[in-house]
């Protein structure tokens, strides 16, 4: 079957990294600089992605594979394939329209990206707070209050209702 297909379509013989050149009797020509073909039998090569500015090159373009970009230090990727870069914040912060802001009391963020999330409400699971939460860390829930010695406290502050964080606009 492969041989039959080759006889019918000479382009099917062109490997990745080349294209079937209609201008030259359908011979296989190498992809020009800054282009690639990742599969065989292609009639054109695709332009390489360019990583500039806030993007940096994670993987160089080759004749058989596209370039891959990520973000420069201090930024993280958004979108599949890193189509946008967003500023990092510190742990215990979130990115708002006005820049990086500390998490409100009762919320935390243990990453450099994303929004501050409410501490776990241990009492909802019938447990008590073993370790208090901080801006950077969630509370650690321990045994249920009934398991504690008399007089032990298990006050969990209510998680405030809040809007999701915003990227700067």
């Amino acid at each position: 079957f492969e041989r039959t297909r080759s006889l019918q379509d000479p382009c099917s013989n062109c490997p990745a990294g080349t294209f079937c050149d209609n201008n030259r009797n359908q011979i296989c020509s190498p992809c020009p600089p800054n282009s690639f073909s990742s599969a065989g039998g292609q009639r054109t090569c695709d332009i390489c992605r360019q990583c500039k500015g806030v993007f940096r090159t994670r993987k160089e373009c080759s004749s058989t594979s596209n370039a891959e970009c990520d973000c420069t230090p201090g930024f993280h990727c958004l979108g599949a394939g890193c189509s946008m870069c967003e500023q990092d914040c510190k742990q215990g912060q979130e990115l708002t329209k006005k820049g990086c802001k500390d998490c409100c009391f009762g919320t935390f963020n243990d990453q450099k990206r994303g929004i501050c999330r409410p501490w776990t409400n241990c009492s909802l699971d019938g447990k008590s707070v073993l370790v208090n939460g901080t801006k950077e860390r969630d509370v650690v829930c321990g045994p249920s209050p009934a398991d504690l010695s008399p007089g032990a406290s298990s006050v969990t502050p209510p998680a405030p209702a809040r809007e999701p964080g915003h990227s700067p606009q």
Epitope: I47, Q50, G53, V54, G79, G81, M84, G99, S167
Partner: antibody, heavy 115, light 107 residues
């Protein structure tokens, strides 16, 4: 809050040099670059060029012989210079922060080229 | 340069309608396409990045799809504030290029 604001003369004579500034606040010029994009009246958007956070530049080949983009970090300003202007350069000129997808733009400034 | 061709160039629709705008790239640009909304006298506003990601604060009635050379912006139920001009743009390769725009008018 991230803000960009273009400013400069609204009227430039043919053959002269168009000079615009983009004053920014809410972000560091050493962290982000800026793009310049223009829009002739009633037409689409055209990318002119960009200056990256390290100070290097990239220009659209259509403008390369007459465009210069620079930065003055002490004034929190980027600048665009376009020489030998003609009526075809009449447009609203925008600066936009470099984040990969143009999430933050200035309000734009109209430049008319006329004698 | 990569050409971005939008269609239609203008479109009349009513509040509540579902509207689709298409953008065709002259080369494969992966998913590196953004969509912008522009109202008269204002700067463009980012709606969609990476072909399908809604930017912060953009209503869920706006959605984007596509990859390679064919892309669409869909507004599921038009609101009065959606009447504007929409542009696609590719952020894949330099020079960055934009479509010629689609003007969305009230029928």
């Amino acid at each position: 809050q991230v803000q960009l604001q273009e400013s400069g003369p609204g009227l430039v004579k043919p053959s002269e040099t168009l000079s615009l500034t983009c004053t920014v606040s809410g972000f560091s010029l050493t962290t982000y670059g800026v793009h310049w994009i223009r829009q002739p009246p009633g037409k689409g958007l055209e990318w002119i060029g960009a200056i990256w956070s390290g100070g290097s530049t990239d220009y659209n080949a259509a403008f390369i012989s007459r465009v210069t983009i620079s930065v003055d970090t002490s004034k929190n300003q980027f600048s665009l210079k376009l020489s030998s202007v003609t009526a075809a350069d009449t447009a609203v000129y925008y600066c936009a922060r470099d984040d990969g997808s143009f999430a933050n733009w200035g309000q734009g400034t109209l430049v008319t080229v006329s004698s | 340069d990569i050409q971005m061709t939008q269609s239609p160039s203008s479109l009349s629709a009513s509040v509540g309608d579902r509207v689709t705008i298409t953008c065709k790239a002259s080369e494969n640009v992966g998913t590196y396409v953004s969509w912008y909304q522009q109202k008269p006298g204002k700067a463009p506003k980012l709606l969609i990045y990476g072909a399908s990601n809604r930017y912060t604060g953009v209503p869920s009635r706006f959605s984007g799809s596509g990859s390679g050379t064919d892309f669409t912006l869909t507004i599921s139920s038009l609101q009065p504030e959606d009447f504007a001009t929409y542009y696609c743009g590719q952020t894949y390769s330099y020079p960055l290029t934009f479509g010629q725009g689609t003007r969305l008018e009230i029928k």
